[in-house]
Interface confidence: low
């Protein structure tokens, strides 16, 4: 059977969801006036960078858009960006596309995404509404790095 990405609604502990604003992802409150993105998630077949301690290696995309999350350094700082790319194009590549890869780890009922390119840097939302989704190495009170994934049929 041909592989297909799994679809998830994603929210954090403060009920912030991910919203597409232009070609950026921002965190916004879960509410009727906001249209959150649906996250596409698919496992990477290449095991080159795998580390079971850190979780499963996955590609992350935005459902209905040819946009995928990737990590790049800007002015010396790891940064989360969206790139025009179909998630299935990444999946079919024999070699792992490292900038697009994240370790997906389960912590209780939550999910944590760590950059493969930049170990120790995690996808995060700010506690303030309207801020971009970003990478952080500071896991704690001011940044939310744990997300709830609600399966979408």
């Amino acid at each position: 059977r041909e592989a297909a990405p799994k679809s998830y609604a994603i929210r954090d502990s403060r009920q912030m969801v991910w919203v597409l604003s232009g070609n950026s992802l921002i965190a916004a409150p879960l509410s009727r006036s906001i249209k959150p993105v649906t996250l596409h998630l698919i496992a990477c077949r290449d095991t080159e960078f795998s580390d079971k301690e850190k979780g499963n290696m996955v590609y992350l995309g935005i459902k209905g858009k040819d946009l995928c999350l990737f990590c790049a350094e800007i002015q010396g700082k790891p940064t989360l960006q969206l790139k025009e790319k179909n998630i299935m194009d990444l999946y079919v590549e024999k070699k792992a596309q490292k900038p697009f890869l994240f370790f997906h780890n389960k912590e209780g009922s939550t999910s944590v995404f760590q950059s493969v390119s930049y170990p120790g840097w995690f996808i995060a939302t700010s506690t303030t509404s309207g801020q971009p989704i970003f990478l952080t190495k500071e896991r704690g009170i001011t940044n939310n790095t744990n997300f709830y994934l609600d399966s979408v049929e």
């Epitope: 912030m16 409150p29 009727r32 009922s109 609600d150």
Partner: antibody, heavy 122, light 111 residues
Framework: ELQLQESGPGLVKPSETLSLTCTVS??????????WGWIRQPPGKGLEWIGN???????YYNASLKSRVTISVDTSKNQFSLKLSSVTAADTAVYYC??????????????WGQGTLVTVSS | ESVLTQPPSVSGAPGQRVTISCTGS?????????VHWYQQLPGTAPKLLIY???NRPSGVPDRFSGSKSGTSASLAITGLQAEDEADYYC???????????FGGGTKLTVL
């Protein structure tokens, strides 16, 4: 039709643990996108949200009660429960269980139990 | 003191229109979180009256309507009837508290 029924002791001694159970009928407690909550109402006062547990097992608690509250689910009995430790007279209230659904957003508590009065007294 | 502020009481004669306000802040209603309204008749459990700011669950008469603007929300009841005499509560989510919050409640008296 989804129905909820609270049960548990009506009298609890100070410093002890209040334990209540909510039995769900007419639907499954594991249904996707549902959340299950507890709300209380002291005599003659307003409503206070205690906490929720959702279909993923994730819990959300009122910050002012968080250190004393545990909400859990028993899927085999189609029940969810509330435990509130170290109770005082200020915890005397009618306790309601309630449920609602996520549909791209939180839609409020649309089904409620009838409520059960818990008195904290020695 | 409640995070969401409601008037303790409002009153109106049968057939009249009354409104109940619910004032929050930039961390709840003002942060675009939805507002829900509940009606609690004497001696009974609360009942969801309005969800998602302005939506009525099936079975709720169209005499009840909700609206939201800025950091406040309102519940309007037109054609007031004796059976509307009850306590009314607003509810929202507050991200600074990471939890759901209720207003203090408003007692509606039908004169």
């Amino acid at each position: 039709e989804l129905q909820l029924q609270e049960s548990g002791p009506g009298l609890v001694k100070p410093s002890e643990t209040l334990s209540l159970t909510c039995t769900v009928s007419g639907g499954s407690i594991t249904s996707t996108n549902y959340y299950w909550g507890w709300i209380r109402q002291p005599p003659g006062k307003g409503l206070e949200w205690i906490g929720n547990i959702d279909y993923t097992g994730s819990t959300y608690y009122n910050a002012s009660l968080k250190s004393r509250v545990t909400i859990s689910v028993d899927t085999s009995k189609n029940q969810f429960s509330l435990k509130l430790s170290s109770v005082t007279a200020a915890d005397t209230a009618v306790y309601y269980c309630a449920t609602g659904k996520y549909y791209e957003t939180y839609l409020g508590f649309d089904v409620w139990g009838q409520g059960t009065l818990v008195t904290v007294s020695s | 003191e409640s995070v969401l502020t409601q008037p303790p009481s409002v009153s109106g004669a049968p057939g009249q229109r009354v409104t109940i306000s619910c004032t929050g802040s930039s961390s709840n209603i003002g942060a675009h979180y939805d507002v829900h309204w509940y009606q609690q008749l004497p001696g009974t459990a609360p009942k969801l009256l309005i969800y998602g700011n302005d939506n009525r669950p099936s079975g709720v008469p169209d005499r009840f309507s909700g609206s939201k603007s800025g950091t406040s929300a309102s519940l309007a009841i037109t054609g007031l009837q004796a059976e509307d005499e009850a306590d009314y509560y607003c509810q929202s989510y507050d991200y600074s508290l990471s939890g759901y919050v209720f207003g203090g409640g408003t007692k509606l008296t039908v004169l």
